[in-house]
Every structure is written in C-alpha cells, then in structure tokens.
Interface confidence: medium
C-alpha cells in the first residue's frame, strides 16, 4: 500500500477519505486505526456502527468521527480540532471476523498557521521546516511518498 498524505491546519478540522470497492467490501464494517511504530500494531481509534446498514451514521470517539458511504464506497474520517499529537501514520480498515484489510495508509500532517498569533507551541511552521525531523510525523512512509524526484508543482 502506498501512503497518502493529508495535511491539516492546527485547531481546524481535517477530513480523510478512503475510497474502496463497494462490492468487494459489501457487508463489512470499517475502522480507523493508528499505527504504533513502523512494525507495531494498528490501534483502533474508531469504527463504524455495529449494524452495517447503519454505517452511514457518524460515530465519534473523542475528536475523531467516522462515517461510511457503503454504496459509493467511501469511508470518511473527520479529525476535529487537529493537534500536533494527531500527526502520524494511520490506516483505514475493512473488518471481517477478526481480520482487517487495509484500505488505505494515511499520513496525517499537522501544520501550524503562522498567521494565527495565538500560542503556537511546538507546531510545525511551513516554510521553516527542512525535514521530517522538525515535524511531528512518523517516518514509516512507503517508497512512493518519498520519490524525491517528484518535482514541486511545475508552476505556470
């Protein structure tokens, strides 16, 4: 699985989408989990409704919500009031029995807004950080994400 980056601004909401094959995953509940270390387990944060037919109902665990469009094949996770400690590697999962299939690996990055003059603490300020070392993110990213040769945005 490649890793998809989703960036959010500290203090704001971030929506993460995980598309999937609705037929292949028909009848399956979904979950959002946080990867603990590069090879560690994925700790469940929140899962969809116990009744699959009610998966469209938004379920919350703290500041994280999950909802599933089972017909369209899109799982949506909302992280409310994004904080630096929310940065890291996550997975969208499709559950079947005691097993879980990974739908998408997600790297959540939390950026400070330097224009917001409230106490920014140790947030990552865009334009200043030169590497992940300065940012509060996990390093377990797939090769495709690290393609150094991908140019920034040829601009026109």
């Amino acid at each position: 699985h490649n890793t998809t980056v989703f960036q959010g601004v500290a203090g704001q909401s971030l929506q993460v989408s995980c598309p999937y094959d609705s037929m292949k995953h028909w009848g399956r509940r979904k979950a959002w989990c946080r990867q603990l270390g590069e090879k560690g387990p994925c700790q469940r944060v929140v899962s969809t409704h116990n009744l699959w037919l009610l998966s469209f109902l938004r379920r919350w665990n703290g500041s994280t919500a999950i909802t599933d469009d089972t017909l369209g094949g899109t799982l949506t996770i909302t992280l409310r009031n994004l904080q630096p400690h929310d940065a890291g590697l996550y997975q969208c999962q499709s559950l079947h029995g005691s097993e879980a299939d990974t739908l998408r690996k997600v790297l959540v990055e939390v950026l400070a807004d330097p224009l917001d003059h409230r106490d920014a603490g140790d947030l990552w300020f865009p334009g200043e950080s030169e590497s992940f070392e300065d940012a509060h993110v996990e390093h377990s990213i797939s090769r495709s994400l690290l393609e150094g040769e991908i140019p920034f945005p040829p601009t026109s």
């Epitope: 998809t4 980056v5 989703f6 960036q7 959010g8 601004v9 704001q12 971030l14 929506q15 990055e109 950026l111 990552w124 865009p126 334009g127 200043e128 950080s129 030169e130 590497s131 992940f132 300065d134 940012a135 993110v137 994400l145 690290l146 150094g148 991908i150 140019p151 920034f152 945005p153 040829p154």
Partner: nanobody
C-alpha cells in the same frame, strides 16, 4: 505562478499557481511574497480539501482573497485595492515530503 504585472495603486490583480506531482487537494497551500531587501513574508494560507480554512497577514486582510480549485490543481490570490507596499515577487508554496517547495514567483509592481 502567473498573473503578476504592473498596476496602479487601487488596482487589482489575480495571481494563479498551477501545481502537479502530488495529491493537491490534500495539501495546505500558502502565498508568500518577497520585496527587495526584505524577508519573505507569508501573505495567505488555505486549508486542504475544500479550502474552507483561510487566513491572512494583517497587512493584506480585507484586500486579498486566497482560493483554490482542486479539480484544476490551482490556487489563486485575488488582490484588490493594491498599494505600493504590495510590490514584491509573489510565490506559492506547499510543504511536500517534509520540505517547503517554491515556485519561481511572479513579479507584482504597484506604481503610478
């Protein structure tokens, strides 16, 4: 970046920045500017996805508007009521793979 040029005080310009090579809609985007002999200054920021979150430097608030079109991988800066002190090279920026990435910039000159 494109859309810069020479404009009279009180005039308007719309800057555009086309991006490629990454999942544009997932990234926070910024417009910076750099005037001669001055440090680069963050002018505006827009959140990822729908770009509902925006914020502006005090010096441009109420005059500049940042927006994005995720379908076209574009970010825009609408600049109204321009002042001579807005003269600078304007850059769009994204923090990608942990590093800030800059375009070549577009010159905006406000003069009568």
């Amino acid at each position: 970046e494109s859309g810069g040029g020479l404009v009279q005080p009180g005039g308007s310009l719309r800057l555009s920045c086309a991006a490629s090579g990454f999942a544009f809609s997932n990234y926070v985007m910024h417009w910076y500017r750099q005037a001669p002999e001055k440090e680069r200054e963050l002018v505006a920021i827009i959140g990822s996805q729908g770009g509902a979150y925006t914020n502006y430097a005090a010096s441009v608030k109420g005059r500049f508007t940042i927006s994005r079109d995720n379908a076209k991988n574009m970010v825009y800066l609408q600049m109204n009521n321009l002042k001579p002190e807005d003269t600078a090279v304007y850059y769009c920026n994204v923090v990608y793979i942990g590093r800030p990435n800059w375009g070549q910039g577009t010159q905006v000159t406000v003069s009568s």
